[in-house]
Each structure stands twice: as structure tokens, then as C-alpha cells.
């Protein structure tokens, strides 16, 4: 969480941002909130990016003002106009690109004053893993697949029964480049599994951590998946 305060001159207002991550090819949110103000016509929201000459986005006098917008963001940004009244200046970024990563500044002007806060935005690819029993294998085998990751993650297997056990000797992980030549499909196979046990396939890079669990018993198979972004720090 980054909390920024205003600049000298007018009274300062508090602006708060939250570091976040964008999944390339999908839409992302850059979070920013400020002290709401009743005089809506005076509210100006500017999003800037370090190293970029033009603006990422500008909202003033109740509408988008995009004449100064940088080419790389053309047609890809929007604020939530109905949320500005409650102090939400978050930016929607469409079709996140790898090059969107960097330091952004959320700069706010209201009738009460000015304020800004920076936000670190990471970009990559992350997806939920699915763990299945591989019935084609010669021994009891589990197959963990996740369609899109970048940068290349690590994959670790764990088991509820054999806690702390190292499964690297009985597992095999491969990374297959997807058609857009950036993200990769992750496939990890775990051999010699036993029934009545819960196995977890944990995939992690510097942006996200995802876990796929599978519990195999004689009568049923239960699955669960979970994904967590690692860098959600507020400013």
C-alpha cells in the first residue's frame, strides 16, 4: 500500500495505491483511491507512467480527456466514472502487454487540494493448475497442467501424508511455448502416487503462486485450485 500526500500550495489530499499484477492478454486494474470531494467538476485524475512522455489517462470535468494520451495506451484505458464520486480513481487497462510493467503515478486534483501516489505494476502470465489422474501411464501417476505462465515458474509437489518430502526425483516438469511465443504451458507429472492421500502441485513465479490439489480415494477424486498474486502491496 502506498499512501501519498499532496504537493505544497493547495491543501494536500491523501491518495492510496496498491501494487498489482497484470495477466498479459487480459484486462487489468491499477488501483487508486482518494479523499472524495463533493465538487465533482473540479476532480482531475491523471495516470502517468515512468519513462513514458504522454499521459496514460486523464479524466477531468466529468469525462476522459485523451488529447495528451501516449500512443501505447490509445484505446486501452478507462476510469470507472460512476466510482469517481466515492473517491475511486482506479484505471482499467485493456489487453495487458508485457511492456505495461513499470512504475505508475496516480495524480489527483480536487477542490480540496492535490495528491499523488506511485504504484508498481508487474506483468506476466499466470493461470490455475488442474491436477488429474493420468490413466495412460503404467503406474499411478498425476498430471498437473496450467495453460499460461510467464516468466518461467518453479513447480513443486507436496503431499499431506508425506509432509516435507522431496518429490523432485519422482516428478518431471516441462514447459511448452505457446503460439504467441511469450507464455508457456506448464506440465508436471508425479509418479508412484498412493491412494487416500492429498497431493498439491504448486506453481510459482515472482508474480503469482497457484496451487492445484487432488485427493484420490478408492471411491472418488476431489480437486481444488487456488491462485494468489504475490505483490499486492498498498502505497
Amino acid at each position: 500500500l502506498i499512501i501519498g500526500f499532496g504537493i505544497s500550495g493547495r491543501h494536500s489530499i491523501t491518495v492510496t495505491t496498491v501494487a498489482s499484477a497484470g495477466n498479459i492478454g487480459e484486462d487489468g486494474i491499477l488501483s487508486c483511491t482518494f479523499e472524495p470531494d463533493i465538487k465533482l467538476s473540479d476532480i482531475v485524475i491523471q495516470w502517468l507512467k515512468e519513462g513514458v512522455i504522454g499521459l496514460v489517462h486523464e479524466f477531468k470535468e466529468g469525462k476522459d480527456e485523451l488529447s495528451e494520451q501516449d500512443e501505447m495506451f490509445r484505446g486501452r484505458t478507462a476510469v470507472f466514472a460512476d466510482q469517481v464520486i466515492v473517491g475511486n480513481a482506479s484505471l482499467r487497462l485493456k489487453n495487458v502487454q508485457l511492456t505495461d510493467a513499470g512504475t505508475y503515478k496516480c495524480y489527483i486534483i480536487t477542490s480540496k487540494g492535490k495528491g499523488n501516489a506511485n504504484l508498481e505494476y508487474k506483468t506476466g502470465a499466470f493461470s490455475m493448475p488442474e491436477v488429474n489422474v493420468d490413466y495412460n501411464a503404467s503406474s499411478e501417476t498425476l498430471r498437473c497442467e496450467a495453460p499460461r505462465w510467464f516468466p518461467q515458474p518453479t513447480v513443486v509437489w507436496a503431499s499431506q501424508v508425506d509432509q516435507g518430502a522431496n518429490f523432485s526425483e519422482v516428478s518431471n516438469t516441462s514447459f511448452e511455448l505457446n503460439s504467441e511465443n511469450v507464455t508457456m504451458k506448464v506440465v508436471s507429472v508425479l509418479y508412484n502416487v498412493t491412494i487416500n492421500n492429498t497431493y498439491s502441485c504448486m506453481i510459482e513465479n515472482d508474480i503469482a503462486k497457484a496451487t492445484g490439489d487432488i485427493k484420490v480415494t478408492e471411491s472418488e477424486i476431489k480437486r481444488r485450485s487456488h491462485l494468489q498474486l504475490l505483490n499486492s502491496k498498498a502505497s
Partner: antibody
């Protein structure tokens, strides 16, 4: 000096509609939101919805969705709130106020009585 | 929606005494909270916004504090004109919601 002036009291039959108005002085329409808040006899305050003329946005409380319409006429600096399918529980004083997110100037209120 | 609760429902205070009114939100509203005063037959009047900022023309005896889910309105020394109903209102999220009110009457 900011002034918010509302129309007069109304008596309506159940099932009918009521349209009440609110005229604001000064720069209210070009700079602020206009909200409608009602108060049933002996009860508390209830936000019904609001309009932000400069943003071109209206927002209604879920409870009134589909029954309430708020519009603003910038040329006459007048906001209107229409409530349809009236029932006896809609008997209340209806206030127009400058604002959202909070409300700094209020009209005098309009008593709308719904009775057969 | 965010539900606002106020306590007590009625507060009986003697003139010159201090009055402390509480308001609680069902989830965090940060400092996005306002307080209003309403006298019988009149429209509400804005006292405090931003949890602690006095509105224009509001006497210094009115003060607001708190953030997140717990808020307090304090009237340091009650004057005869302060006997009224007080409402809190959150504006963190649409729809804006009011508390049920606290009536401050003469002891």
C-alpha cells in the same frame, strides 16, 4: 448563496406515479451531483438515488430500481424524481439535496401522501 | 450494501454536558463518513464530512473522529439548539446509506 427549492406537497392514489422537482441556484448543476433522500413519518433517512449531470450518470438504490427515475434539465437547473407504482409505504417527505458523496445543501422537502 | 448502525438510540443529556454518539459500519468505509443534524420539521444539516472535517459554519463544539468501521460524534458542551436527531452516512460505496439516528434529548 446556494438554494435548493422543491415543488409543493402531493396527494396520490396507490398504483399511480408522482413526479417532484427541485430547482438549484448557482453552479450546482454544472459542478455537483443531485440526490434524492426520503423520510417516512417518524423514520430515518433513506437515499433513493442521484444524478451527476456533468458525468451523465444516474445511480439508484436497489430497493427503488425500476420504480424511480431521476433526470436533470441543465437549461432550467431543475432535477426531477419520478416514483411509480406508489403504495402507502411511500408516504414520506422527499428531500432533494446537493451532493453525493455527502450532502451539503438540502431542499425544504415535499410531503407525498399515498392514500386511497 | 453497507449497513450503518448507531448507538444509543436515545441519549439524554443536560445542557452544558458532553454528548458522545457512536456510529458503526458493517464493513470499512475508510474516512468516508458524514454526520447530519435534523430538528423536527426541518431538513437535515451537514455537520461533519471526511469523518472529522467540520462543514462550513458548524461550531467548534462539534467534532468527529474514527475511521474504518467505528466513528464518534462529540458535542463538547450541549447548547439548547443542539437537541435534535443525529444521523451518520457512509459514502465509501453506492448506495449511500444512513444510520437509523440517535435522538439527543434534554435530561
Amino acid at each position: 448563496q446556494v438554494q435548493v427549492v422543491q415543488s409543493g406537497a402531493e396527494v396520490k392514489k396507490p398504483g399511480s406515479s408522482v413526479k417532484v422537482s427541485c430547482k438549484a441556484s448557482g453552479d450546482t448543476f454544472s459542478n455537483y451531483a443531485i440526490s434524492w433522500v426520503r423520510q417516512a413519518p417518524g423514520q430515518g433517512l433513506e437515499w433513493m438515488g442521484g444524478i451527476i449531470p456533468i458525468f451523465g450518470i444516474t445511480n439508484y438504490a436497489q430497493k427503488f430500481q425500476g420504480r424511480v427515475t431521476i433526470i436533470a434539465d441543465k437549461s432550467t437547473r431543475t432535477a426531477y424524481m419520478e416514483l411509480s407504482s406508489l403504495r402507502s409505504e411511500d408516504t414520506a417527505v422527499y428531500y432533494c439535496s446537493r451532493g453525493g458523496p455527502y450532502f451539503d445543501y438540502w431542499g425544504q422537502g415535499i410531503l407525498v401522501t399515498v392514500s386511497s | 450494501e453497507i449497513v450503518m448502525t448507531q448507538s444509543p438510540a436515545t441519549l439524554s443529556v443536560s445542557p452544558g454536558e458532553r454528548a458522545t454518539l457512536s456510529c458503526r459500519a458493517s464493513q470499512s468505509v475508510s474516512s468516508n463518513l458524514a454526520w447530519y443534524q435534523q430538528k423536527p420539521g426541518q431538513a437535515p444539516r451537514l455537520l461533519i464530512y471526511g469523518a472529522s472535517t467540520r462543514a462550513t459554519g458548524i461550531p467548534a463544539r462539534f467534532s468527529g473522529s474514527g475511521s474504518g468501521t467505528e466513528f464518534t460524534l462529540t458535542i463538547s458542551s450541549l447548547q439548547s439548539e443542539d437537541f435534535a436527531v443525529y444521523y451518520c452516512q457512509q459514502y465509501k460505496k453506492w448506495p449511500f446509506t444512513f444510520g437509523p439516528g440517535t435522538k439527543v434529548d434534554i435530561k
